[in-house]
């Protein structure tokens, strides 16, 4: 009979998790010469060490420190792109604008993007059946704590003008409870960051409203200004055209507004 397992509300560890993490690490270090020194086996050992044999509702940021140390990476000033509730477009953008970086363009974010993982207390097994759900089970689960840890570090190391892409189609364009609103905003360092520039991405083709006047954007401006960081906001009315113009800035249609 299979050993009794804690049943959580969330989906289990992503199939072939160890292999996936290692495959991604190898691929990343090959493509990024500045990370060639990274030993992927040590990265996997540190990743595993953060959650294996631990109760999956009692994970701390401290658990991930060995991994964070191994994955230390710096982004040039003015090149950090944060995002909230609009991951796909942010990633499409950095795939074209290769000198800008989201968290998922960095080693640790790249390793964990779209993956789920958890272990079990006192066993060396990975739980492929179920993992804690942030709402229904607990917030201090391996996945949530990982993203909180690496997001904090990513924000702390940002410098110059930091950009953030926000989803203008949502009821809360800026959400205080998102990772951006609860972690990244509060960990931007005023002595290193001169300004935060928000790009509000419009959803509807005919949407010509100025979403920079949205109350939640005003709330973001207030939080940022109180931290002695300047705030700017831009509407991106046509995200498709925006991406096209990043690819081909010389295109005549790109001289008009996007």
């Amino acid at each position: 009979l299979p050993r009794w397992r804690q049943q959580w509300s969330g989906s289990g560890t992503t199939s072939r998790f160890p292999e996936t993490v290692l495959a991604r690490c190898v691929k990343y270090t090959e493509v990024h010469p500045e990370m060639r020194h990274v030993d992927c086996q040590s990265v996997w050992d540190a990743f595993k060490g953060a959650f294996i044999s631990k109760y999956p509702c009692n994970i701390t940021e401290e658990d991930y420190q060995p991994l964070v140390k191994l994955g230390t990476q710096t982004v040039p000033c003015n090149k950090t792109l944060l995002w909230s509730r609009i991951k796909d477009l942010a990633h499409q953008f950095t795939q074209v604008q290769r000198d800008m970086f989201t968290l998922e363009d960095m080693l640790l974010g790249y390793l964990a993007d779209d993956l789920t993982w958890c272990g079990e207390f006192n066993t060396f097994e990975i739980n492929y059946q179920s993992c804690p759900d942030w709402r229904k089970d607990c917030s201090n689960n391996p996945v949530s704590v990982f993203w909180k840890t690496v997001s904090r570090r990513f924000a702390e190391t940002a410098c110059g003008v930091v950009h953030v892409m926000l989803n203008g189609s949502r009821s809360k364009i800026f959400d205080k409870n998102s990772t951006f609103g609860s972690v990244e905003v509060h960990n931007l360092q005023p002595e290193k960051v001169q300004a935060l520039e928000a790009w509000v991405i419009h959803g509807g083709r005919e949407d010509s409203r100025d979403l920079c006047q949205d109350p939640t954007i005003k709330e973001l401006e207030s939080i940022i200004s109180k931290r002695n960081i300047r705030f700017f906001c831009k509407n991106i009315y046509r995200p498709d055209k925006f991406l096209q113009c990043v690819k081909n800035p010389e295109d005549s249609s790109c001289l008009s507004g996007i």
Epitope: E19, V26, K27, E30, Q41, Y128
Partner: antibody, heavy 116, light 108 residues
Framework: QVQLVQSGAEVKKPGASVKVSCKVS????????IHWVRQAPGQGLEWMGG????????IYAQKFQGRVIMTEDTSTDTAYMEMNSLRSEDTAIYYC?????????WGQGTLVTVSS | EIILTQSPAILSLSPGERATLSCRAS???????LSWYQVKPGLAPRLLIY???TRATGIPVRFSGSGSGTDFSLTISSLQPEDCAVYYC?????????FGQGTRLEIK
């Protein structure tokens, strides 16, 4: 411990198909991918293909593309390798293997003889 | 595709002698993902070394691996009659996984 047990030897005629099974125990197919390797008489080891978790699909060596299908039944923890349009040069021992990036574990091998 | 080239193709030595087998990669291979196998007729490949230098479970200490980047080697410090086999290097850092063409070790 990890064990891979393969199906028995097969004798096939040219043009026929063969399906080799590989039952894993000591772990489940959700943990590690299966790869297939063959060794023809007097020849070296040749990787045929295997599951790439990063792309979420099976990658085949160019040589076997379109002629080999690798599948898995996670409910029984069994992997399968089916080869079509067999020819005499496909006579070989076929191995399933697992544990990429870690310690590789191998099945005992299945001898497939293609002869008219 | 990473091509692994082994040398020599055949090595003929006496018991007690030291054997050094070479494996050269067409591009840099992460050491952790370079393995060595021993293959005897009718038997499944036996993993000797993984991570370029770590002996697999149950492998005698006379087998050792070394190297990094594009040059790797397997050394058998004191040959035994049962070491007569074909030896293959393998890389699994990239798909397709590739093997060297093998070195046949003959014991005189």
């Amino acid at each position: 411990q990890v064990q891979l047990v393969q199906s028995g030897a097969e004798v096939k005629k040219p043009g026929a198909s063969v399906k080799v099974s590989c039952k894993v125990s000591g772990y489940t197919l959700t943990e590690f991918s299966i790869h297939w390797v063959r060794q023809a008489p007097g020849q070296g080891l040749e990787w045929m293909g295997g599951f790439d978790p990063e792309d979420g699909e099976t990658i085949y060596a160019q040589k076997f593309q379109g002629r080999v299908i690798m599948t898995e039944d996670t409910s029984t923890d069994t992997a399968y390798m089916e080869m079509n349009s067999l020819r005499s040069e496909d006579t070989a021992i076929y191995y399933c293997t697992t544990g990429r990036f870690f310690d590789w574990f191998w099945g005992q091998g299945t001898l497939v003889t293609v002869s008219s | 595709e990473i091509i692994l080239t082994q040398s020599p193709a055949i090595l003929s030595l006496s018991p007690g002698e030291r054997a050094t087998l070479s494996c050269r990669a067409s591009q840099s291979v992460i050491s952790r993902f370079l393995s060595w196998y021993q293959v005897k007729p009718g038997l499944a490949p036996r993993l000797l070394i993984y991570g370029a230098s770590t002996r697999a479970t149950g492998i005698p200490v006379r087998f050792s691996g070394s190297g990094s980047g594009t040059d790797f080697s397997l050394t058998i410090s004191s040959l035994q009659p049962e070491d007569c086999a074909v030896y293959y290097c393998q890389q699994d850092s990239n798909l397709p996984i590739t093997f060297g063409q093998g070195t046949r070790l003959e014991i005189k």
